[in-house]
Amino acid sequence: MMTGTIETTGNISAEKGGSIILQCHLSSTTAQVTQVNWEQQDQLLAICNADLGWHISPSFKDRVAPGPGLGLTLQSLTVNDTGEYFCIYHTYPDGTYTGRIFLEVLESSVAEHGARFQIP
């Protein structure tokens, strides 16, 4: 039985041109994490594998940095980065856990004067 839960940063906003950290945390399970995937809609951003370390998709290499921890840092944000992001934890023996984060990238002035989403 899958007993784990994923805690995420939820709905967040960031300024165009800035950076944001996406983070998920798997808890309440003794399952061993073997791999974490980060995806944007259906696009793979990055993988962190227990045996192979990090792999950043070539198309995101210039704008994505791993960490902190199992998180992912998105840099030089554009309005096109707005959307859903998923952390997918592959574990043994539980299987797969998925967390969702919605990122809204705002024009600088909008972000400064009251973003719609705040980091909890």
Partner: antibody, heavy 117, light 107 residues
């Protein structure tokens, strides 16, 4: 097998600079963060900073921002820490250690840096 | 920066005893807490990752628990090889930080 090789010791004069090395083998160097940790004699562990060889991205503890500079040479799978304006306070063991899915599963043996005239 | 406070600073015990070492974070670090052992003149060694997850080659007498801000490393039936320094470390946010350490010494 994974290995992080560091020179055993370095002796330098106060005011000088030094570049400590950490040669990695047994894994894909560009896929793991490399961290540097300082330990003064008989004291605790201090995180200096880290570098991701795949992109050169670095992070530093504020305390070490004007003291250490982290670089890598991916062609030789070697990480470096350049320490400047050395004083006796910089005398310590400096460890390199890597991070992938979790920190810090492999450590170098440490380089003992002695700053003395 | 996240401050990790370990207690006690020193623990004097007898082989065969069981002990608990504490690590408290200044703010929530979720489950991003790891434990290391360091013997004199050696590099640190990872004992437990992500609060309680085991590491290959580490004896089962080492176990971890806790969440959020309060964490514990437990060692059941201490062996002579277990004496040394123990550090906790957080990977929740940069800068990563270590606790000040607990020295486990033979009584």
């Amino acid at each position: 097998q994974v290995q992080l090789q560091q020179p055993g010791s370095e002796l330098v004069r106060p005011g000088a600079s030094v570049k400590l090395s950490c040669k990695a083998s047994g894994y894909t160097f560009t896929s793991y963060w490399m961290h540097w940790v300082k330990q003064r004699h008989g004291q605790g562990l201090e995180w200096i900073g880290n570098i991701y060889p795949g992109s050169g991205t670095t992070n530093y503890d504020e305390k070490f921002k004007n003291k250490g500079t982290l670089t890598v040479d991916t062609s030789s799978s070697t990480a470096y820490i350049h320490l400047s304006s050395l004083t006796s306070e910089d005398s310590a063991v400096y460890y390199c250690t890597r991070e992938g899915l979790y920190p810090f599963d492999y450590w170098g043996q440490g380089t003992t840096l002695t700053v003395s005239s | 920066d996240i401050v990790l406070t370990q207690s006690p600073a020193t623990l004097s015990v007898t082989p065969g005893d069981s002990v608990s070492l504490s690590c408290r974070a200044s703010q929530s670090i979720r489950n991003n807490l790891h434990w290391f052992q360091q013997k004199s003149h050696e590099s640190p060694r990872l004992l437990i990752k992500y609060v309680f997850q085991s590491i290959s080659g580490i004896p089962s007498r080492f176990s971890g628990s806790g969440s959020g801000t309060d964490f514990t490393l437990s060692i059941n039936s201490l062996e002579t090889e277990d004496f040394g320094m123990y550090f906790c470390q957080q990977s929740n946010s940069w800068p990563y930080t270590f606790g000040g350490g607990t020295k486990l010494e033979i009584k």
